[in-house]
Interface confidence: low
């Protein structure tokens, strides 16, 4: 069941969409480029992106900085309850933009810079991305993560955007984990409803890559839940 | 540390216009986002426009949406506020304020550690 404001977009957004995405970006110094596509169905809040180093393979730190962007950004594939207004489908065609700040227990911090438009029935996403601080010793620099647990967006309107709030947790080939605070700023290029506060729920796995890392594969299930919702969707 | 100067401000008449600048040293310019707060004496200082670190997301106050225009130069490493259609009620005096990082409640001077310091415009 969809939102009315959703019914009117779905001449716009339908059940099955393709997206393109390029990042160019940099960690500790570091540049890079990747391009990549994907398709998902934006109304079941399933996606998957197949994903290509360009420039700077093999990258000398872990892909688990970058796989969020790709896809917690790729937000127009969150389901959403009927009641909950959808932001983010609702700003199109004009699309959305959003910048992200993610900051690592050791100090590390990564910016991303990311639009997203509509262009010929397909999603164009534009991201950029810095990482600095990342210790050469750490578990980034290192390659020592082996993807994110699942989580939990906290989602609520401030200054006329929705803002996002995570508490992401990588793991560790030790066993152990390795902490981020992750703010996200929405904003639609143009007046929309926004929602009041709610969670998305939030898989990302890397389903498949080469030995480097320099061709990646990734899965998301995301899912829009009145705050008190759990997780346990995800795992199904 | 982050120093902020501001330039600009003046006398203008109503339906006039005025540039404010800011400039900022001390820090990579890129990693820091930017507010504007105007206070008339007597009252709390009012929200008017802030511009995050990547340019991407800027906010006006109610006031001023649609008359106030702000922006950034990260090569000169300044903000901009060009006020046009000004009013006597906007006559106050403007200060920018900084922050390290993502600026992520724009609209709370509590939120930016780092100020300018100050300059008057008055409408007439």
């Known amino acids: 069941m969809v939102s009315k404001g959703e019914e009117d977009n779905m001449a716009i957004i339908k059940e099955f969409m393709r997206f393109k995405v390029h990042m160019e970006g940099s960690v500790n110094g570091h540049e890079f480029e990747i391009e990549g596509e994907g398709e998902g169905r934006p109304y079941e809040g399933t996606q998957t992106a197949k994903l290509k180093v360009t420039k700077g393979g093999p990258l000398p730190f872990a892909w688990d900085i970058l796989s969020p962007q790709f896809m917690y950004g790729s937000k127009a594939y969150v389901k959403h309850p009927a009641d909950i207004p959808d932001y983010l489908k609702l700003s199109f065609p004009e699309g959305f933009k959003w910048e992200r700040v993610m900051n690592f227990e050791d100090g590390g911090v990564v910016t991303v810079t990311q639009d997203s438009s509509l262009q010929d029935g397909e999603f164009i996403y534009k991201v950029k991305l810095r990482g600095t601080n990342f210790p050469s010793d750490g578990p980034v620099m290192q390659k020592k993560t082996m993807g994110w647990e699942a989580s939990s967006e906290r989602m609520y309107p401030e200054d006329g955007a929705l803002k996002g709030e995570i508490k992401q947790r990588l793991k560790l080939k030790d066993g152990g984990h390795y902490d981020a605070e992750v703010k996200t700023t929405y904003k639609a290029k143009k007046p929309v409803q926004l929602p009041g506060a709610y969670n998305v729920n939030i898989k990302l796995d890397i389903t498949s890559h080469n030995e480097d890392y320099t061709i990646v594969e990734q899965y998301e299930r995301a899912e829009g839940r009145h705050s008190t919702g759990g997780m346990d969707e995800l795992y199904k | 540390q982050v120093q902020l100067v501001q330039s600009g401000g003046g006398l203008v008449q109503a339906g006039g216009s005025l540039r404010l600048s800011c400039a900022a040293s001390?820090?990579?310019?890129?990693?820091?986002?930017v507010g504007w707060f105007r206070q008339t004496p007597g009252k709390e200082r009012e929200f008017v426009a802030a511009?995050?670190?990547?340019?991407?997301?800027?906010n006006y106050g109610d006031s001023v949406e649609d008359r106030f225009t702000i922006s950034r130069d990260n090569a000169k490493s300044a903000v901009y506020l060009q006020m046009n259609s000004l009013k006597p009620e906007d006559t106050a005096v403007y200060y920018c304020?900084?922050?390290?990082?993502?600026?992520?409640?724009?609209?709370?001077?509590?939120?930016?550690?780092?100020w300018g310091q100050g300059t008057q415009v008055t409408v007439s």
């Open positions: 511009i995050s670190w990547s340019g991407l997301i800027i």
């Open positions: 304020a900084a922050r390290i990082g993502m600026n992520y409640y724009y609209a709370r001077e509590i939120e930016y550690p780092y």
């Open positions: 001390g820090r990579t310019f890129s990693d820091i986002a």
